[in-house]
């Protein structure tokens, strides 16, 4: 029997600082370029090496941004969502969903670690 | 990973054309941010063209005489070259990136892209 994937959704408050190039990170997705079928949401699909989202570290790659400063990301076209970015000013607020890849195993099967028992 | 191959590069006298493609892998290729490069023997690799979301971008020497295009729909960036001249001779590369930046875009910093291809040859002669 084959096991069930399921995801763990967190949310996060990211407080970023822009660093001398910038915040680092590549988006996908808005209302003209879904990225994910059904969602037209912000997603990371590049974190740079030694920028400021890489330095701190818990952005990463897959995420989902909710929102910036405070503003809503819903129904933006993609390039209003980039330019949102460039002018978020000094310190940046990044509200974040992670969405972990969780492999349960097969119905019935006791996985290791498992509390229970 | 993202593979590319281009393709369309030859040999052609001064003042002809050349149409190069770049096929990249990938479902998501509309979100690519893509450009051409060229590395000349013993000369620094140069920027020659780019295409993102919102626009195209290309080097002073070029201007007016390539064109960067794309088709989603093939998953292929081209780079139409009109009007060749000899120091047009080199190895063109395609680069990629997923996505666009959320800094402000420098299209002829290698380092904004990861994903590079092996690169087709084009040879001007006068």
């Known amino acids: 029997m084959n096991g069930r994937v399921d995801y763990l959704v967190t949310e996060e408050e990211i407080n970023l600082t822009r660093g001398p190039s910038g915040l680092g990170f590549n988006i996908v997705g808005g209302t003209d370029q879904q990225y994910v079928s059904n969602d037209s949401g912000i997603y990371v699909s590049r974190i740079k090496e030694n920028g400021a989202a890489a330095l701190d570290g818990r952005l990463q790659e897959g995420d989902k941004i909710l929102s910036v400063n405070g503003q809503d990301l819903k129904n933006l076209l993609h390039q209003d969502a980039v330019d949102l970015f460039r002018n978020a000013g000094y310190a940046v607020s990044l509200r974040v969903q992670h969405r972990l890849q969780v492999q349960n195993g097969p119905i019935g099967h006791r996985g290791e670690g498992d509390p229970s028992g | 990973d993202v593979q590319l191959v281009e393709s369309g590069g030859g040999s052609v006298q001064a003042g002809g054309s050349l149409r190069l493609s770049c096929t990249a892998s990938g479902r998501t290729f509309s979100t690519y941010t893509m450009a051409w490069f060229r590395q000349a023997p013993g000369k620094e690799r140069e920027f020659v063209a780019a295409i993102t979301w919102s626009g195209t971008y290309y080097a002073d020497s070029v201007k007016g005489r390539f064109t960067i295009s794309r088709d989603n729909a093939k998953n292929t960036m081209y780079l139409q070259m009109n009007s060749l001249k000899p120091e047009d001779t080199a190895v063109y590369i395609c680069?990629?990136?997923?996505?666009?930046?959320?800094?402000?875009?420098?299209?002829?910093?290698?380092?904004?892209?990861?994903?590079w291809g092996q690169g087709t040859q084009v040879t001007v002669s006068s």
């Open positions: 680069a990629a990136v997923i996505g666009s930046t959320v800094d402000s875009y420098s299209p002829s910093d290698p380092l904004e892209y990861d994903y």
